[in-house]
Interface confidence: low
Amino acid sequence: KVFGRCELAAAMKRHGLDNYRGYSLGNWVCAAKFESNFNTQATNRNTDGSTDYGILQINSRWWCNDGRTPGSRNLCNIPCSALLSSDITASVNCAKKIVSDGNGMNAWVAWRNRCKGTDVQAWIRGCRL
């Protein structure tokens, strides 16, 4: 599923991401834009052999199990395939664990490079939330 901007903002808000660990909803929508272009089925292979999955590009080395990443930790205790669902519940729940891990949203390279320090509220402007 490819979400619309405001559609995703509403879904993320419903799942409790707004101001989760101090990160406003705009940060999460911005991260999703530059990680996956709002596509729940986005996948990208990394040079270390791991793969990033889903709308927030969650990594199989640490967070989920795809059965194919050597030394996977699966800290979210989920199959990576769950992160490709049009239902973003699994991605959100895992993201909450990631953002609580110590580095906050710096764990997402795209957020660090494209969203951090910008007017992230622009990503939810005009949305009926």
Epitope: A42, R45, G67, S81
Partner: antibody, heavy 116, light 107 residues
Amino acid sequence: QVQLQESGAEVMKPGASVKISCKATGYTFSTYWIEWVKQRPGHGLEWIGEILPGSGSTYYNEKFKGKATFTADTSSNTAYMQLSSLTSEDSAVYYCARGDGYYCYWGQGTTLTVSS
Amino acid sequence: DIELTQSPATLSVTPGDSVSLSCRASQSISNNLHWYQQKPHESPRLLIKYASQRQSGIPSRFSGSGSGTDFTLSINSVETEDFGMYFCQQSNSWPRTFGGGTKLEIK
């Protein structure tokens, strides 16, 4: 139960292209990688590459880039591999398998013969 | 690419014998090594995953061991249905690679 059903044997002329199909049943097709493997007598098993049907992501063994092209149709739960510019070296049995790192489920194989 | 070398190429045994098949990787692959059996005109069948985990439905006479670069598939008291080709495969890195195979034949 999980099953992978491949298309039937093909006899093709050198220079032609062929498209092999692999229909999956018994699991959520879009969220598991489909792998393609080549087997020639005396050459063992060779990994050609893989596709994740739900996203269309593909990864190819460098050796088969330009030779193989993967596609998938999630509406029919079918993966396809097209082989182009066929030569006698492409004569082999081609398998699809469900990728979990290891390959627990395999198709029955499609025999391709390239002959003038 | 990781090269997998299987030995011996052919193993001639009598039913009831116990045998060991070897698979050696060109670099360390942890336990990311899987074993398959293949009979003529059939697809490969997964026997052992991750070096030592027997796949569901595989008889207990099959066992796997090893880590790093050296791996062994053992068959305790070979039965006639066990004859065929055995392949190892690594999932430590891409491209996935297979060993050249060991043929288990009746003496």
